[in-house]
């Protein structure tokens, strides 16, 4: 009874129907169910479409511009369970722009375990409001139902018998009302009694066993289900998996030899995006978690003694890094067996981007060349880098390799890192603005002082546009408020004073004292520092009354952590010699000051004598907050309460809005309107900043989620057929 | 045939304690939701206590809620309910019942707290 | 939480007649109602579940009603074993009894 058909993976139906019969035989799709951009589509052409087999949805189920689809009740009458594993933008059940759809009609839809629901822009689109969404899911607040032809009030949603005076359908209360559920004209919403939990229940109330999710056929009965709240097995839904059966896409229970040919099928495969599985927590899962590698005799996942190696084997020995894409490519390796060749010249974000691609590198087996990359400023991206072999050494016998790089300033910060180079040479030509100093500092770091011959670091052609700094300026005063730091610093003049341009002085937001100088900069434009020019302070003859430069800065947040460095500004001298120097990063906070407000207060009367209020933290604590206080006062009772006549027609009962407590957007627009019509003369408030502000708030998150379908949906045509449940895009 | 024996009753100071246990024999026992039931004295019937046939799932009412505890032994086919901090106004005759519409019933076993 | 008011409390009935008790629930219950038949040192016996279900192996003689929230039981031909007192449970939202009806036979 249980599943009883196929399992299928997850599918992306597009463009026509050809495709939808694939979902023929499934009763479980385990991946995501996506059926979209349909545009020729007609009402007819669904009539006979039906797959009754279908219980449950493991990831999601979205529907996007399919044309001529008015209801799903036919096309799916026995979905039960959308589980949510993964999620499309944290909805489990996406209904966008279906222009003809009337009714969802999912009557058997009995629970959404993971994630929420959206249901906009669908103009078409009733039976909405008589659907108790807190019966099938719990985040009901996080649902997003707008823009929908149930929210003008112009549905007139009739549920199974009310045409003839009875009501045929469970109620559930919304805003103290009863309201009937249904999800058609002739389907009532199953309502369990609440002791039933999530588990389901008959027809009659009496409930499935706890192993069950969503319904049963029969009561207490573990093989009885329709779906399986934990894990199916052998036609039994089952809590755990037992020995010698694996936990597999958190639904089902597989043997050892399922989860092995999965291995085996991925290995023999060309496909990319493809997984391993292996074994790891009585689990069979894609990959092993951080931390641990696998043991391929038996698929099982074991501790990794320190950082887990994954060697990356280099195609014909070695590899061009030359965008983010290709530095995605090595993604988590640990050894590279070959050599690395980097050669960017541009791009977005690179420093970040590299080091989350290039960061977990330990050990190169070859030689690394840095070659043209105008668009690096420091190598600080490798940032476990500890060992260059050189087993392959460049032309001349080099492990590591810089040749002209127009704005590499750094090679690593070497107070915090190591480096060995097993053999080979080091070679440094053409890189304008790397200080000499950085590199005889790698030559003693890393063990390859007296290997280079005369030629192989140019001294004329390294350095020879930078400001080596080679003293330290030391910071003289330091004060604080809430949004200002103030900073003095001991004065520097270079031997010829007009080569002093002035000081720069680089800030940023710091959580945690590990900054370095050349952390997230690029040559590109990308810098997480702050920059402030300071002219140079007025030059005394008098070394002792010399003026102490120094800056106020200003527009900061209250108890911030702030890293921040100064150095100087000096002028290219010609005898290729530049004098300069520079502060050490120190680490400032600024002071307390008032939070701002609480957000989002709720009050509700929960008694004649009672009122429960609550509130989110502020968004800017602006210190530590220790407590709140709450004040309160009498109100004079509105004489308008008593006076009114509570039998006059037109008065509406309240009606339910989507995410309470707020009132959505539409809502607040119908009531104004409503109160207009009445009184004639009356025009409605201005917003308050407080509404303007929800309403922007609104429109960003309305933009951000059509973006990130757009992206998702919309991709480029493949030359093969068919994407698999192992499909790795939304998440 | 399904058969639900109570016992564990008694004769309690306020503020004491007793454990009721419920043999059950006749059906899958592990399969099952079960529950206590009480009738007081003046002839009224209170739910007391639901536990899920896993054990997974509690609920009470807010009268006997942190009071009272119901749990179960799925290998030896018994419920068991902890009374603690007892009051007069918890002398009654407890029932276990079945599932979740209590469509069987013990014989009771008659708890009297008093001074 | 959800109150049960049963009518009558007791009432008295003379053998092949017919009896109705009535349970009204504080708020809709969706037909998720029980009728029990409680003798004295017995347990209670569940006779119709879902308004109008009757539980396997009893007679036709007894039935059930109603819907939001009135509910009616009825014993037709009454007979001498049918002395008992009759609860309504809900179990739309726990479980809630509904305070007895003593039937006797005249």
């Known amino acids: 009874h249980l599943y009883p058909g196929e399992v299928c993976p997850g599918m992306d139906i597009r463009n026509n129907l050809t495709r939808l019969h694939e979902l023929e035989n499934c009763s479980v799709i385990e991946g995501h169910l996506q059926i979209l951009l349909m545009f020729k589509t007609r009402p007819e052409d669904f009539r006979d479409l039906s797959f009754p087999k279908l219980i449950m949805i493991t990831d999601y189920l979205l529907l996007f511009r399919v044309y001529g689809l008015e209801s799903l009740k036919d096309l799916f009458p026995n979905l039960t369970v959308i589980r949510g594993s993964r999620l499309f933008f944290n909805y489990a059940l996406v209904i966008f722009e279906m222009v003809h759809l009337k009714e969802l009609g999912l009557y058997n839809l009995m629970n959404i375990t993971r994630g929420s629901v959206r249901i906009e822009k669908n103009n078409e689109l009733c039976y909405l409001a008589t659907i108790d969404w807190s019966r099938i899911l719990d985040s009901v607040e996080d649902n997003y139902i707008v823009l929908n032809k149930d929210d003008n009030e112009e549905c007139g949603d009739i549920c199974p018998g009310t045409a003839k005076g009875k009501t045929n359908c469970p109620a559930t209360v919304i805003n103290g009302q009863f309201v009937e559920r249904c999800w058609t004209h002739s389907h009532c919403q199953k309502v369990c009694p609440t002791i039933c939990k999530s588990h389901g229940c008959t027809a009659e109330g009496l409930c499935c066993h706890s192993e069950c999710l969503g319904n049963c056929s029969q009561p207490d009965d573990p093989t009885k289900c329709v779906a399986c709240r934990n894990f199916y097995l052998d036609g039994r839904c089952v809590e755990t998996c037992p020995p010698p059966y694996y936990h597999f896409q958190d639904w089902r229970c597989v043997n050892f030899s399922f989860c092995q040919d999965l291995h085996h099928k991925c290995k023999n495969s060309r496909r990319q995006g493809c997984h391993q599985y292996v074994i790891h927590n009585n689990k069979c899962i894609p990959e092993c978690p951080s931390g641990y590698t696998m043991n391929s005799s038996n698929l099982l996942c074991t501790p990794c003694l320190g950082p887990c190696p994954k060697v990356c084997h280099l195609l014909e020995g070695e590899k061009t890094i030359d965008s983010v894409t290709s530095a995605q490519e090595l993604r988590g390796c640990t050894v590279i067996n070959g050599s690395l060749i980097i050669n960017i010249r541009g791009g977005n974000n690179l420093a970040a981007e590299l080091e989350a691609n290039l960061g977990l590198i330990e050990e190169i087996s070859g030689y690394l060349k840095i070659r043209r990359s105008y668009a690096l400023v420091s190598l600080s991206f490798f940032r476990k880098l500890r060992l260059i072999r050189g087993e392959t050494l460049e032309i001349g016998n080099y492990s590591f390799y810089a040749l002209d790089n127009q704005n590499l300033r750094q090679l690593w910060d070497w107070s915090k890192h190591n480096l060995t180079i097993t053999q080979g040479k080091l070679f440094f030509h053409y890189n304008p603005k790397l200080c000499l100093s950085e590199i005889h500092k790698m030559e003693e770091v890393s063990g390859t002082k007296g290997r280079q011959e005369r030629n192989d670091i140019a001294l004329k052609t390294n350095g020879d546009q930078a400001s080596c700094e080679n003293e330290l300026l030391k910071f003289s005063y330091i004060r604080t408020s809430f949004d200002k730091i103030l900073l003095r610093w001991e004065p520097y003049w270079p031997p010829d004073f007009r080569d002093l341009l002035g000081f720069m002085l680089f800030y940023k937001e710091a959580p945690y004292q590990n900054v370095t100088e050349f952390d997230g900069q690029d040559a590109c434009g990308s810098n997480s520092w702050t920059v402030v020019d300071i002219d140079p302070p007025l030059r005394s003859n008098d070394p002792k009354s010399q003026n102490h430069p120094g800056w106020l800065m200003r527009g900061l947040k209250p108890w911030t952590q702030y890293a921040i460095f100064v150095k100087t500004l000096v002028t290219f001298s010609d005898e290729r010699r530049t004098y300069g120097a520079k502060s050490d990063i120190i680490y400032v906070q600024t002071d307390a000051t008032n939070p701002s407000v609480p957000l989002d207060p709720i009050s509700v009367s929960n008694s004649s004598s009672q009122i429960i209020l609550k509130w989110k933290p502020p968004s800017d604590p602006n210190g530590n907050i220790t407590h709140y206080l709450v004040f309160w006062e009498r109100q004079a009772e509105d004489s308008e309460l008593f006076e009114l006549d509570y039998c006059l027609k037109g008065l509406k009962l309240p009606s339910r809005t989507w995410s309470p407590p707020f009132e959505s957007e539409d809502s607040q627009k119908h009531n104004q309107s409503e109160y207009e019509d009445s009184a004639g003369e009356c025009c409605s408030c201005p917003k308050t900043d407080s509404q303007i502000l929800k309403e922007l708030e609104e429109s960003s998150f309305r933009k951000t989620f059509e973006d990130y379908l757009h992206n998702v949906v919309f991709v480029p045509r493949k030359t093969s057929s068919g994407t698999g449940a192992e499909d790795p895009r939304p998440s | 045939e399904v058969q639900l024996v109570e016992s564990g009753g008694g004769l309690v100071k306020p503020g004491g304690s007793l454990k009721l246990s419920c043999a059950a024999s006749?059906?899958?026992?592990?399969?099952?939701?079960m529950s206590w039931v009480r009738q007081t004295p003046e002839k009224r019937l209170e739910w007391v206590a639901t536990?899920?046939?896993?054990?997974?799932?509690?609920d009470y009412p807010d009268n006997v809620k942190g009071r009272f505890t119901i749990s179960r032994d799925n290998a030896k086919n018994n419920l068991y309910l902890q009374m603690s901090h007892l009051r007069s106004e918890d002398s009654a005759m407890y029932y276990c019942?079945?599932?979740?519409?209590?469509?069987?019933w013990g014989q009771g076993t008659l708890v009297t707290v008093s001074a | 939480d959800i109150q049960m008011t049963q009518s009558p409390s007791s009432l008295s009935a003379s053998l092949g007649g017919k009896v109705t008790i009535t349970c009204k629930a504080s708020?809709?219950?969706?037909?998720?109602i029980a009728w029990y038949q409680h003798k004295p040192g017995k347990g209670p016996r569940l006779l119709i579940h879902?308004?109008?279900t009757l539980q396997p192996g009893i007679p036709s003689r007894f039935s059930g009603s109603g819907s939001g929230r009135d509910y009616s039981f009825s014993i037709s031909n009454l007979e001498p074993e049918d002395i008992a007192t009759y609860y309504c449970?809900?179990?739309?939202?726990?479980?809630?009894f509904g305070g007895g009806t003593k039937l006797e036979i005249k």
């Open positions: 708020q809709h219950i969706n037909k998720y």
């Open positions: 449970l809900q179990y739309d939202n726990l479980y809630t």
């Open positions: 019942a079945r599932a979740t519409n209590f469509a069987y």
């Open positions: 006749g059906f899958t026992f592990s399969n099952y939701a």
């Open positions: 536990i899920s046939d896993g054990g997974h799932y509690i």
């Open positions: 879902y308004t109008s």
